[in-house]
């Protein structure tokens, strides 16, 4: 007869490991007992369990409650055992020693490999600001056994660097993603992808990029100066900018206080019916935590009567 087993049994942390040991005997041969031991190099054999044809299953105190026979029906020639709730410390070499009648004793070894799936973590780097050079956007760390693979999935242009730390029974892998921040990256996803044989599918952690910036400010509303004449209603100036975080707006008049009746509504400056006293230099001040910008415009409120008089003069002059 001969023993049938596996060279390697692979199990995920917390799962049950079946350690196979089947005696393929000739007719009439019987298995008296199967002794399972852990036999790591440099250490003596440590009893795991003894399966006896008459006495049944004996489990070593060190494995009490963790070793069982596979559920029925059982073949009397099958010396396999189940190791419940495999932990990393169970990884190693195991030996089954089968005593048969009349053929004698047989033994076989297998290696138990316990996969420890990683629990990845993503840590954002320092605040990203437009104008910075190459900056850490995020780092992703995953520890497992064997060492996990850590990659990045993103549309954003950047560079990656990885480092690995080996521990006694596992390895930690850290990957960093660096980029040159620009406003176009704002709101873009940066995804850490962790692969490992103990995972049914890759684990993904997504970080949304936030790049602080503030665009140049400009003022809209003076495109047609002829509209800015005495008596006009509904005149307004709008300050244009964008930023992250969203900016706040403030309006001032460079050559004095804002005229009475002028309303400030965020980025918009609303005028009452125009008079000449609304003429002046207006400043839009845009700011966020990252920066501030100013844009100024000159408002010149026209008097239609003056204009028509001049026209008459010009005509008469011709």
């Amino acid at each position: 007869g001969e023993l049938e087993t596996s060279d390697v049994v692979t199990v995920v942390l917390g799962q049950d490991a079946k350690l196979p040991c089947f005696y393929r005997g000739d007719s009439g041969e019987q298995v008296g007992q199967v002794a399972w031991a852990r036999v790591d190099a440099g250490e003596g054999a440590q009893e795991l369990a003894l399966l006896h044809s008459k006495y049944g299953l004996h489990v070593s105190p060190a494995y009490e409650g963790r070793v069982e026979q596979p559920p029925p029906p059982r073949n009397p020639l099958d010396g396999s055992v189940l190791l419940r709730n495999a932990v990393q410390a169970d990884e190693g070499e195991y030996e089954c020693r089968v005593s048969t009648f009349p053929a004698g004793s047989f033994q076989a070894r297998l290696r138990l490999r316990v996969l420890v799936p990683p629990l990845p973590s993503l840590n954002p780097g320092p605040a990203l600001e437009e104008g910075q050079g190459l900056t850490l956007a995020a780092s992703c760390t995953a520890e497992g056994s064997p060492a996990p693979s850590v990659t990045w999935d993103t549309e954003v242009k950047g560079t990656t660097s990885s480092r690995s730390f080996k521990h006694s029974r596992s390895a930690a892998v850290t990957s960093e993603f660096h980029l040159v921040p620009s406003r176009s990256m704002n709101g873009q996803p940066l995804t850490c992808v962790v692969s490992h044989p103990g995972l049914l599918q890759d684990q993904r952690i997504t970080h949304i990029l936030h790049v602080s910036f503030l665009a140049e400010a400009s003022v809209r509303g003076l495109e047609d100066q002829n509209l800015w004449h005495i008596g006009r209603e509904g005149a307004m100036l709008k300050c244009l900018s964008e930023g992250q975080p969203p900016p706040s707006y403030n309006w001032t008049r460079l050559d004095g206080p804002l005229p009475s009746g002028v309303r400030v509504d965020g980025d918009t400056l609303g005028f009452p019916p125009l008079t000449t006293e609304h003429s002046g230099i207006y400043v839009c001040h845009v700011s966020n935590e990252f920066s501030s910008r100013d844009s100024q415009v000159t408002v010149d409120v026209l008097d239609p009567q003056e204009d028509s008089g001049k026209q008459v003069d010009l005509v008469s002059a011709s």
Partner: antibody, heavy 123, light 107 residues
Framework: EVQLVESGGGLVQPGGSLRLSCAAS????????MSWVRQAPGKGLEWVSA????????YYADSVKGRFTISRDNSKNTLYLQMNSLRAEDTAVYYC????????????????WGQGTLVTVSS | DIQMTQSPSSLSASVGDRVTITCRAS??????LAWYQQKPGKAPKLLIY???SLQSGVPSRFSGSGSGTDFTLTISSLQPEDFATYYC?????????FGQGTKVEIK
Amino acid sequence: EVQLVESGGGLVQPGGSLRLSCAASGFTFSSYAMSWVRQAPGKGLEWVSAISGSGGSTYYADSVKGRFTISRDNSKNTLYLQMNSLRAEDTAVYYCARAELLAFDVYTASDYWGQGTLVTVSS
Amino acid sequence: DIQMTQSPSSLSASVGDRVTITCRASQGISSYLAWYQQKPGKAPKLLIYAASSLQSGVPSRFSGSGSGTDFTLTISSLQPEDFATYYCQQHYTTPPTFGQGTKVEIK
């Protein structure tokens, strides 16, 4: 025929010592683990100590640990129990018995027993 | 240590009676259980090993059953020579421990 014959029992004062012997015949002595089991007068059976076939492993009940020593001489087919610091509660018939090693520290039931030797601890 | 609880502690029966003695272990011991018979002034004698295997030379009226924690010794038809004290013993762990015994007396 398997035979186990105990000797060495007798009357001893509390605090005294005694050495019991068990002569074995009719089987390959070194292939079997051996045990001492005692029975106080009118009481049940109490396991005392055991030793592996080679003598490399010894086991003791908590009640005798540090006072009793089990040993064997495979060349003489003899099992011993050295009993020191004897107490009144050690009074009992002491039996030797044999058992087979299955594997590791797992043994069969004791299939053969000696006739016993009486140890009386009294002042 | 594993505690072995035997019941009853004594019983009276007549020749020809069917006698059942039970033994309970405080934890699972698979079939690492033996039954012994002891007569006054004599050494214990192994009747049953591995919970249900009959020791060579023991009459077939003796039988054992059970595994795990609950075990039974049955004498199918009590004979005059069977009046004795019966002990169960576990040898799953060290120290091996005995039940307190069951004395079978003549009714």
